[in-house]
């Protein structure tokens, strides 16, 4: 810890300015008033302090606000934010989206640090839910943010927030997360017309049930193979050859290239070879002609 030493004559800081970069650490400690620093935090960012000098400034703020910094200070932390520990941040009460944006800007272009994760957690908990503006902000800085949340956390996302989600924000989501997000997206986009609806819902379809896929197959949507390959296997299996043909439209040709991969592989195994042959794509592995198809799920339900 920096030793308490008297400020040399004439060195007492009257404002936060560039002259302070020439102060030694002990001089900063002795000559900069914490209250002055707190009121002029917005100037710190414009001054090229060394990391050691920033450590001193942080120490002064910690002494002034042992229970946690006020938002007026937090909003102007700038690069000093990088000096904060998750423990420091847990003491904060951040309610302004502008404050959140300002701090995320400091960390822009880097992976989400433990500090940022703690800040976001504090902010979202303070708001009570992940509203549209917050989601918009977070996904702009961290496209993978949504997929870093647990299904339980995602359940607090209101459907209205789904409008802020871009396709790339869902790239790393797993099926359990999409299971939670899909019904919200369906609700959010329910008043859109067919083609516009499909464009919006497409990224969320990894959580769609069979009934919805069947409904989409009647709407001339031309789902691409990349989207089809991300569908839940259990949702694809009950689809008929005709339904898959309608769902994919001109992309049905792509099934051949994917016939060894899930869910196409598993779907093929459930279809009659006769029906697969009607596609003219040479898909192999269907149920041979004359074989009886037992619906085991129905059998279980009856027994």
């Amino acid at each position: 810890e920096v030793e308490k030493t008297a400020c040399p004559s004439g060195k007492k800081a009257r404002e936060i300015d560039e002259s302070l970069i020439f102060y030694k650490k002990w001089e900063l400690e002795a000559c900069v008033d914490a209250a002055l620093l707190a009121t002029q935090m917005d100037r710190v960012n414009a001054i090229p302090f060394t990391y050691e000098q920033l450590d001193v400034l942080k120490h002064k703020l910690d002494e002034l606000y042992p229970q946690g910094y006020p938002e007026s200070v937090i909003q102007h932390l700038g690069y000093l934010f990088l000096k904060m520990s998750p423990e420091d941040i847990r003491k904060w009460n951040v309610t302004s989206l502008e404050t959140l944006k300002a701090l995320l800007e400091v960390n822009k272009g880097h992976e989400m640090s433990p500090q940022v994760a703690t800040l976001i957690d504090r902010f979202v908990k303070g708001r009570g839910q992940l509203d549209k503006d917050t989601l918009d902000t977070l996904t702009a800085f961290y496209p993978g943010y949504l997929c870093s949340l647990s299904p339980e956390e995602l359940s607090s996302v209101p459907p209205s927030s789904i409008w802020a989600v871009r396709p790339q924000d869902l790239d790393t989501c797993d099926p359990r997360q999409l299971d939670v997000l899909y019904p919200k997206a369906r609700l959010a986009f329910q008043n859109m017309n067919g083609s516009e609806y499909f464009v919006k819902i497409q990224s969320f379809l990894g959580g769609a049930p069979t009934e919805d896929l069947k409904a989409l197959s009647q709407q001339n949507v031309s789902m691409d193979l990349a989207t089809f390959m991300k569908l839940r296997t259990d949702a694809v299996l009950p689809l008929t050859v005709a339904e898959v043909q309608k769902l994919l439209g001109p992309h049905v040709e792509g099934l051949k290239a994917e016939e060894r991969h899930r869910p196409v592989r598993d779907w093929i195994l459930r279809q009659r070879q006769d029906d697969l042959d009607t596609l003219g794509l040479g898909l192999q592995g269907g149920i041979p002609n004359g074989y009886l198809v037992l619906d085991l799920s129905m059998q279980e339900a009856l027994s």
Epitope: S222, E253, D277, L279, G280, G282
Partner: antibody, heavy 116, light 107 residues
Framework: EVQLVESGGGLVQPGGSLRLSCAAT????????MHWVRQGPGKGLVWVSR????????VYADSVKGRFTISRDNAKNTLYLQMNSLRAEDTAVYYC?????????WGQGTLVTVSS | DIQMTQSPSSLSASVGDRVTITCRAS??????LTWYQRKPEKAPKSLIY???SLQSGVPSRFSGSGSGTDFTLTISSLQPEDFATYYC?????????FGQGAKLEIK
Amino acid sequence: EVQLVESGGGLVQPGGSLRLSCAATGFTFSSYWMHWVRQGPGKGLVWVSRINSDGTSTVYADSVKGRFTISRDNAKNTLYLQMNSLRAEDTAVYYCARGRGIMTYWGQGTLVTVSS
Amino acid sequence: DIQMTQSPSSLSASVGDRVTITCRASQDIGSWLTWYQRKPEKAPKSLIYAASSLQSGVPSRFSGSGSGTDFTLTISSLQPEDFATYYCQQYKSYPLTFGQGAKLEIK
């Protein structure tokens, strides 16, 4: 390796007949739709006809309807095009091709010349 | 029948160039369009299907775009082996129809 080899082309007089064959190897022939496509001298590609995998459904271009017949023998892995009432404008290299609406594999073609 | 019109019918370019060929359908064909590459004495090769989906094994410098009536084939950086004739073809309805072809030559 998928291979399609056309044969049966040659010189024929207007009004005459010719039967083209396309021998398929390297894939399950009976599962695929097949097509005939032609290209006249100095011209572009023109689709002629299509047959489904089991031979129960055929489609023709208007220019050959009633004169040409597409057929297949899945036991012999062979596609056929029976061409009757041939005209000078039927002169072209004829290709057989595998696929649905998209022809992913083609043969090297066989030349049909209709001339007196 | 659906008419397919390609432009330009021929073009000259150099290795490394970005090249664009367009194809117009006489009526709405959605995304039911494919592009072929044809080299002399060789069978046509399918490059793109469903207007924008790359056939497996085709280099990523080839891309397709468009829907409805206007479509584009783009080669982002021409390679020596790309000099050929390119055809578009609709498979929305029978009879299947091709564009007249666009011959890409070395400048």
